[in-house]
């Protein structure tokens, strides 16, 4: 998905939270130098996904995927690509 | 840069009321099962997280959005 390319660390953290994998979340949060209180807060969100089971995680993942691939986001991604191309062309 | 619609979704998940969050989810996926799940998750997060927890989660988001990996 084009949007995942635009902010990979966001999707890393989101899917680590929604997946319920604490180790994966810790690894993702290390990439952004999260403090201990920040990790604790993110784990509380993760707990909600874990407590509500697999179906809940799948459904919320579906929502995020739908938003990320919606015209609201894809239009944004196309616009960003056009801007990048313009800058690259001007930079030559 | 993160898509504004995604940012809005995440912001509402953390700082909006359950009705506001579910309303926004409905704009993209209006299935009853999806909306019910969104409300359950939102209510859970609101029950678990203190004011300080939410400040810390928002701080993580700031770090994500300003990261070279974003």
């Amino acid at each position: 998905v084009k949007m995942a390319e635009t902010c990979p660390i966001f999707y890393d953290v989101f899917f680590a939270v929604a997946n319920g994998n604490e180790l994966l979340l810790d690894l993702s949060l290390t990439k952004v130098n999260a403090t201990e209180p920040e990790r604790t807060a993110m784990k509380k969100i993760q707990d909600c996904y874990v407590e509500n089971g697999l179906i809940s995680r799948v459904l919320d993942g579906l929502v995020m995927t739908t938003i990320s691939s919606s015209k609201d986001c894809m239009g944004e991604a196309v616009q960003n690509t056009v801007e990048d191309l313009k800058l690259n062309t001007l930079g030559r | 840069e993160i898509c504004p619609a995604v940012k809005r979704d995440v912001d509402l998940f953390l700082t909006g009321t359950p009705d506001e969050y579910v309303e926004q989810v409905a704009q993209y996926k209006a299935l009853p099962v999806v909306l019910e799940n969104a409300r359950i998750l939102k209510n859970c997060v609101d029950a678990k997280m203190t004011e300080e927890d939410k400040e810390n989660a928002l701080s993580v988001l700031d770090k994500i959005y300003t990261s070279p990996l974003c």
Partner: antibody, heavy 119, light 107 residues
Framework: EVQLVESGGGLVKPGGSLRLSCAAS????????INWVRQAPGKGLEWVSL????????YYADSVKGRFTVSRDNAKNSLYLQMNSLRAEDTAVYYC????????????WGQGTTVTVSS | DIQVTQSPSPLSASVGDRVTITCRAS??????LAWYQQKPGRVPQLLIY???TLQSGVPSRFSGSGSGTDFTLTISSLQPEDVATYYC?????????FGQGTKLEIK
């Protein structure tokens, strides 16, 4: 100390414009949703607008939609209310108020700034 | 939009009286209701949120109850310093409508 201070009120003619400011201190401003609430002389409280911490979502009361614009500058810890096409019924004390993250209520209010719309 | 109606207004009571103010929403709002107190010439102050939770620093003579559409603010023993206008507000979603206010006076 958590504080909000409004400024920018004054006398303006009907159809005119005014920009109100709200300066915040004592808390991490960028994290908090902020409301504008107004109170006409001798009347009750009326909610006007809310802007989220990152400006990703904004809500307005129907009575001001299309005429008022709320914005914020997190680097300056400041909130703004641009009021255009002002009417006599917009005459009020305007308050900015912080919305809590946990319970979504207005826990901190500014002292208010008075806007008078009159010819 | 959901309407919020407060009653009675105004309200006159004696010191030591038990005072009750009611607030009704035109549709269910769960417990997303707050009560604010505004003393004459002062800024509004949060009293109660989530229908029944007392804000820190608020005297225990104040209490709130209700859920759905019908809510109540009670002052168990009215004090002279409670002279103020009381507003309920629904905050489940925008617009965050206030009730019209109940002006409380001492007899």
């Amino acid at each position: 100390e958590v504080q909000l201070v409004e400024s920018g009120g004054g006398l303006v003619k009907p159809g005119g414009s005014l920009r109100l400011s709200c300066a915040a201190s004592g808390f991490t401003f960028r994290n908090y949703n902020i409301n504008w609430v107004r109170q006409a002389p001798g009347k009750g409280l009326e909610w006007v607008s809310l802007i989220s911490g990152s400006s990703s979502y904004i809500y307005y009361a129907d009575s001001v939609k299309g005429r008022f614009t709320v914005s914020r500058d997190n680097a300056k810890n400041s909130l703004y209310l641009q009021m255009n096409s002002l009417r006599a019924e917009d005459t009020a004390v305007y308050y900015c108020a912080r919305r809590t993250l946990s319970y979504y209520v207005m826990d901190v209010w500014g002292q208010g700034t008075t806007v008078t719309v009159s010819s | 939009d959901i309407q919020v109606t407060q009653s009675p207004s105004p309200l006159s009571a004696s010191v030591g009286d038990r005072v009750t103010i009611t607030c009704r929403a035109s549709q269910g709002i769960s417990n997303y209701l707050a009560w604010y107190q505004q003393k004459p010439g002062r800024v509004p102050q949060l009293l109660i949120y989530a229908a029944s939770t007392l804000q820190s620093g608020v005297p225990s003579r104040f209490s709130g109850s209700g859920s759905g559409t019908d809510f109540t603010l009670t002052i168990s023993s009215l004090q002279p310093e409670d002279v103020a206008t009381y507003y309920c507000q629904k905050y489940n979603s925008a617009p965050y409508t206030f009730g019209q206010g109940t002006k409380l006076e001492i007899k």
